[in-house]
């Protein structure tokens, strides 16, 4: 008795974080014996889509010409060969940005901060949200991910940094989201430039390991040190 068919690989071009309205292609790569490919989306009727293989039959293309909320979510794919269906692929999480209006990002007491002192980045949304993400530009992943407890919704989240070093300097943005779908993010806030002056250098924060689903740039996210975040929000390190 032959073992189970090997699982296919599933990936997205140009990647798995897509702005509203932009196109995305989902690829499923199996074997040369594949006769059909199936794409399933979590919490949607299965199969979500079926495609015949492209020559030489080892992959199929699933095209999304214009990203909307409906396409955001968690996908798996399978292929069918003469001996049956394969194991499912590892999941692909397709995230959409632009689902909600952009939050406002500010720095307290000021975006100009002396090394060794403290600063708090404040992300504020117009409507109540329960998840806030802080991004350092050109880093691939959120620095901080704050989610409210018990679904309590907030208009803001605080991201304290203390003590500040030169590593904290740079351009930041934040996103907001609802917990019922972490695949949907707001438009990004306008950028905030954090300028660190002075020579009171503390220890450099060590980068966190970045696990990339979308193939991220080489700069790794830095984890701001700091005190307890905004009341009612839990800190999640990404």
């Amino acid at each position: 008795q032959a073992g189970p068919l090997p699982k296919p690989t599933l990936w997205a071009e140009p990647g798995s974080v897509i702005s509203w309205g932009n196109s995305v292609t989902i690829w499923c790569q199996g074997t040369l014996e594949a006769r059909e490919y199936r794409l399933d989306k979590e919490e949607s009727p299965a199969p979500w889509d079926r495609q015949n293989p492209l020559e030489p039959k080892n992959k199929a293309r699933f095209s999304i010409p214009s990203m909307t909320e409906d396409y955001a979510g968690r996908y798996r794919c399978y292929y069918r060969s003469p001996v049956g269906w394969s194991q499912p692929s590892d999941p692909l999480e397709l995230v959409m940005t632009g689902a909600y209006s952009k939050p406002t990002l500010s720095a307290l007491p000021s975006p100009l901060v002396t090394s060794g002192k403290s600063v708090t980045l404040l992300c504020q949304s117009r409507s109540p949200m329960d998840t806030f993400l802080l991004i350092k530009e050109r880093a691939a992943h959120p620095l901080l991910h704050l989610r409210s407890e018990h679904g309590a919704q907030q208009h803001q989240a605080e991201f304290p940094m203390s003590p500040v070093t030169s590593v904290h300097g740079g351009t930041y943005r934040c996103f907001s989201s609802h917990g019922f779908s972490h695949y949907l993010l707001s438009h990004p806030s306008d950028p905030l430039e954090l300028i660190v002056s002075g020579s009171l250098e503390g220890p450099r924060p060590s980068p966190t390991r970045s696990v990339s689903t979308a193939a991220g740039p080489e700069d790794q996210p830095l984890m701001p040190t700091g005190s307890v975040p905004h009341s009612g929000l839990r800190r999640h390190w990404e």
């Epitope: 932009n22 196109s23 790569q29 691939a140 351009t171 740039p217 080489e218």
Partner: antibody
Framework: QVQLQESGPGLVKPSETLSLTCTVS????????WSWIRQPPGKGLEWIGY???????NYNPSLKSRVTISVDTSKNQFSLKLSSVTAADTAVYYC?????????????????WGQGTTVTVSS | DIQMTQSPSSLSASVGDRVTITCRAS??????LAWYQQKPGKVPKLLIY???TLQSGVPSRFSGSGSGTDFTLTISSLQPEDVATYYC?????????FGQGTKLEIK
């Protein structure tokens, strides 16, 4: 700082297989899309194909029947094999990385390139 | 497959001129377009990605615009060191086709 270096024979005989390796230093191959591009003398750039760090591949349809790109994550290398070469395959061959996604900026193009290696197909 | 067409194929301009190169995709590619500069005998260099984002370290006289099918690379004030061939490339979905290139010379 990530750097790429192509290696392989500079001369290949017609009908044989061209084999090149790209070594990634200063960073991990375990992310990103890794591409091969070539440029025949006096001509433009031609995308050959990519391999995703997971091993998934896509190739230029005009070369698909002759191309294989593979990855060896343990050696931080990816490789190109082009079979049944002719004089038309004479070119400078580049390896390159397509950078990833940056929130607020979008998807990068090919931000890191090797220096290129000249391959001549001749008997 | 989507074709990428650049125009003009070559152009000559004076130092200080504003230079525009266009790239047209045969189908929509959202903003998944990059521009590269290749100086004679050198490796291509990424200038612009996501249609309009300037790559780190690239002079601000370079800018990109467009979305969908029509894209533009602009050099606001041409400098002697800008002599090169410029290529656009789509990367929305394989194949990641390049344009045929635009050779830029100084008058």
């Amino acid at each position: 700082q990530v750097q790429l270096q192509e290696s392989g024979p500079g001369l290949v005989k017609p009908s044989e297989t061209l084999s090149l390796t790209c070594t990634v230093s200063g960073g991990s191959i375990s992310s990103y899309f890794w591409s091969w591009i070539r440029q025949p003398p006096g001509k433009g750039l031609e995308w050959i194909g990519y391999i995703y760090y997971s091993g998934s591949t896509n190739y230029n349809p005009s070369l698909k029947s002759r191309v294989t790109i593979s990855v060896d994550t343990s050696k931080n290398q990816f490789s190109l094999k082009l079979s049944s070469v002719t004089a038309a395959d004479t070119a400078v061959y580049y390896c390159a990385r397509r950078g990833g996604y940056s929130y607020g900026y979008g998807y990068y193009g090919m931000d890191v390139w090797g220096q290129g290696t000249t391959v001549t197909v001749s008997s | 497959d989507i074709q990428m067409t650049q125009s003009p194929s070559s152009l000559s301009a004076s130092v200080g001129d504003r230079v525009t190169i266009t790239c047209r995709a045969s189908q929509g590619i959202s903003n998944y377009l990059a521009w590269y500069q290749q100086k004679p005998g050198k490796v291509p260099k990424l200038l612009i990605y996501a249609a309009s984002t300037l790559q780190s370290g690239v002079p601000s006289r370079f800018s990109g615009s467009g979305s969908g099918t029509d894209f533009t690379l602009t050099i606001s004030s041409l400098q002697p060191e800008d002599v090169a061939t410029y290529y656009c490339q789509k990367y929305n979905s394989a194949p990641w086709t390049f344009g045929q290139g635009t050779k830029l010379e100084i008058k």
